[in-house]
């Protein structure tokens, strides 16, 4: 299709080489089509647009994204060619940063139902640059945490080094929806609830003598509880002896509960004590079996192909540790009688 009639928007993504970060493009269809199509309207539910020249479907995923190759080749369907780019409804998610993401991205409705719809498209020219060392050293992170029940704030990473006074007007989105009341480089939250968690996008306009473009940053916000003050506790094994049959295979499971920590480096491992010798056992990887806001339960198994006489004199020790401290639980195998 002819993209010359598409509205054009220029965006800049300056990414930090020190951290993982994501980026999004919204299918900013011209008003009022956008409101009908992607449900990102600025209108209140009682206000109805006077005319809807674009009669697209209400299905939120009925948008098609393309990339325009720089060499003039035909448009490429994003879904087929770019595994690190994911389409979610009217949003395009870039999972990994890199200058190779620079280029022109076009979105338009899948269903063309009227002659007006042909021109219903947006071309976004995205420029991606790594942050230079000259940039602000202490810029806000692209992953920010809000402590539940307390006050907090969400800072726009690309503007966090500027004072509120010199900051340009900022447009904020949360999970793709416009936050119309927020215009500064920082969103202040009086009391943090779990619904404050989500993907926030901050946009501001930067201009030079030639052109203007939108500088965009994406912030993943987590609502968290305070760091635990407790070392992990072992939920299983509970008993310090276990009845077994010689010659049979055996799996002993160690399940431990770790309280929430912002910087979470849980350790769960098995080691064997034989007399006063001890060594760590190479066992299958640990797996998380339950995760809540407050804690996480992690499991790791030790597998014996067959229980030998030697195993009966050994102690099998599960060791768990977080930043507060460690806990151990040892199991002695006992031969089943009869």
């Amino acid at each position: 299709f002819n993209i010359s009639g598409c509205s054009t928007k220029k965006l800049l993504w300056t990414y930090s080489t020190r951290s993982e970060e994501e980026f999004v493009l919204f299918c900013d269809l011209p008003e009022p089509q956008k409101s009908h199509f992607c449900h990102r309207n600025r209108l209140s539910p009682k206000q109805v647009p006077e005319h809807l020249p674009f009669m697209g479907s209400n299905d939120l995923s009925d948008v098609q994204w393309y990339q325009q190759p720089s060499n003039g080749d035909p448009l490429e369907d994003i879904r087929k060619s770019y595994p690190h780019i994911i389409q979610d409804k009217c949003t395009l998610h870039f999972l990994t940063p890199g200058v190779n993401n620079s280029g022109s991205y076009i979105c338009r409705p899948k269903m063309i139902k009227s002659p007006y719809d042909v021109a219903c498209c947006v071309k976004m020219i995205l420029e991606v640059k790594p942050q230079t060392n000259a940039s602000c050293e202490y810029s806000a992170s692209h992953k920010q945490d809000l402590l539940l029940g307390s006050t907090g704030s969400i800072s726009c990473p690309s503007l966090s080094c500027q004072s509120d006074a010199q900051s340009p007007a900022v447009t904020w989105y949360k999970n793709g929806k416009l936050l119309s009341v927020e215009r500064s480089n920082r969103i202040v939250v009086d009391e943090v609830y779990d619904y404050h968690q989500g993907t926030y996008v901050c946009d501001y306009t930067q201009s030079d003598t030639v052109s203007s473009w939108t500088v965009r940053a994406v912030v993943q916000v987590r609502t968290i509880v305070g760091d635990t003050k407790l070392k992990p506790d072992i939920l299983d094994p509970v008993e310090d002896t276990l009845e077994v049959e010689l010659g049979k295979p055996l799996t002993i499971s160690c399940k431990a509960r770790f309280g929430f920590e912002r910087v979470f480096n849980p350790v769960i491992k098995w080691y064997i004590k034989d007399s006063d010798l001890e060594w760590e056992v190479s066992v299958p990887e640990a797996k998380s079996i339950k995760s809540t806001l407050k804690d996480e339960i992690i499991e790791r198994n030790i597998i014996l192909e067959k229980v030998t006489q030697r195993d009966l004199r050994r102690k099998f020790v599960c060791f768990v540790q977080n930043s507060i401290g460690n806990t151990t639980q040892s199991v002695q195998l006992k031969e089943k009688r009869g």
Partner: antibody
Framework: SLEESGGDLVKPEGSLTLTCTAS?????????MCWVRQAPGKGLEWIAC????????AYYATWAKGRFTISKASSTTVTLHMTSLTAADTATYFC??????????????WGPGTLVTVSS | AIKMTQTPSSVSAAVGGTVTINCRAS??????LAWYQQKPGQPPKLLIY???DLASGVPSRFKGSGSGTEYTLTISGVQCDDAATYYC??????????FGGGTEVVVQ
């Protein structure tokens, strides 16, 4: 591999320190480093072992306590200090790694031995 | 201290025959028992560990058995290369350790 050194001709009542150097591995808590000796034409005699981990617990044959001292000099060397030597201590002294490897399999390694002769 | 008593001190066997060596500990050593083979001029070689487990690379004609205080090494289908001196050892170092006096195996 293990290599013993320090074997020598020593006078009765003299002292001597033997050194065992490990190459290809460093000490860990899954095994012991031991000393065993064998007098010419005789059987094997266990002297002492030291836990190769941080505990450094040392165990001695009853007859060796007081005269012989086993210690870890570094993460790859263990020594045996012997005092009040007599002709009966004349033997080839072997350094032995005994215990388990990192996978819990038994691991037993002997050095070639070093000869200690006690004579006036 | 643990004392290990090994019998016999010498045994001769024909090629293809069977040799049995016994070892008695002065107290329960919880199967912390090793058997070694030693040939003249060489350090000993581990044959059996934990009373009954065959060490890596050791032929299956060597078999260890026993528990508590009584242990046995059996060599079935004796070969010329089996001529050597065999030692049992308590390797329960934390409880004290000791070698047996040795058994010389002569193959005819």
């Amino acid at each position: 591999s293990l290599e013993e050194s320090g074997g020598d001709l020593v006078k009765p009542e003299g002292s001597l320190t033997l050194t065992c150097t490990a190459s290809g591995f460093s000490f860990s808590s899954s095994y012991y480093m031991c000393w065993v000796r064998q007098a010419p034409g005789k059987g094997l005699e266990w002297i002492a072992c030291i836990h190769a981990g941080s505990s450094g617990a040392a165990y001695y044959a009853t007859w060796a306590k007081g005269r012989f001292t086993i210690s870890k000099a570094s993460s790859t060397t263990v020594t045996l200090h012997m005092t009040s030597l007599t002709a009966a201590d004349t033997a080839t002294y072997f350094c032995v790694r005994d215990g388990y490897d990192d996978y819990g399999d038994p691991f037993n390694l002997w050095g070639p031995g070093t000869l200690v002769t006690v004579s006036s | 201290a643990i004392k290990m008593t090994q019998t016999p001190s010498s045994v001769s066997a024909a090629v293809g025959g069977t040799v049995t060596i016994n070892c008695r500990a002065s107290e329960d050593i919880k199967s912390y028992l090793a058997w070694y083979q030693q040939k003249p001029g060489q350090p000993p070689k581990l044959l059996i560990y934990d009373a009954s487990d065959l060490a890596s690379g050791v032929p299956s004609r060597f078999k260890g058995s026993g528990s508590g205080t009584e242990y046995t090494l059996t060599i079935s289908g004796v070969q010329c290369d089996d001529a050597a001196t065999y030692y049992c050892q308590s390797v329960w170092y934390a409880g004290g350790a000791a070698f047996g006096g040795g058994t010389e195996v002569v193959v005819q």
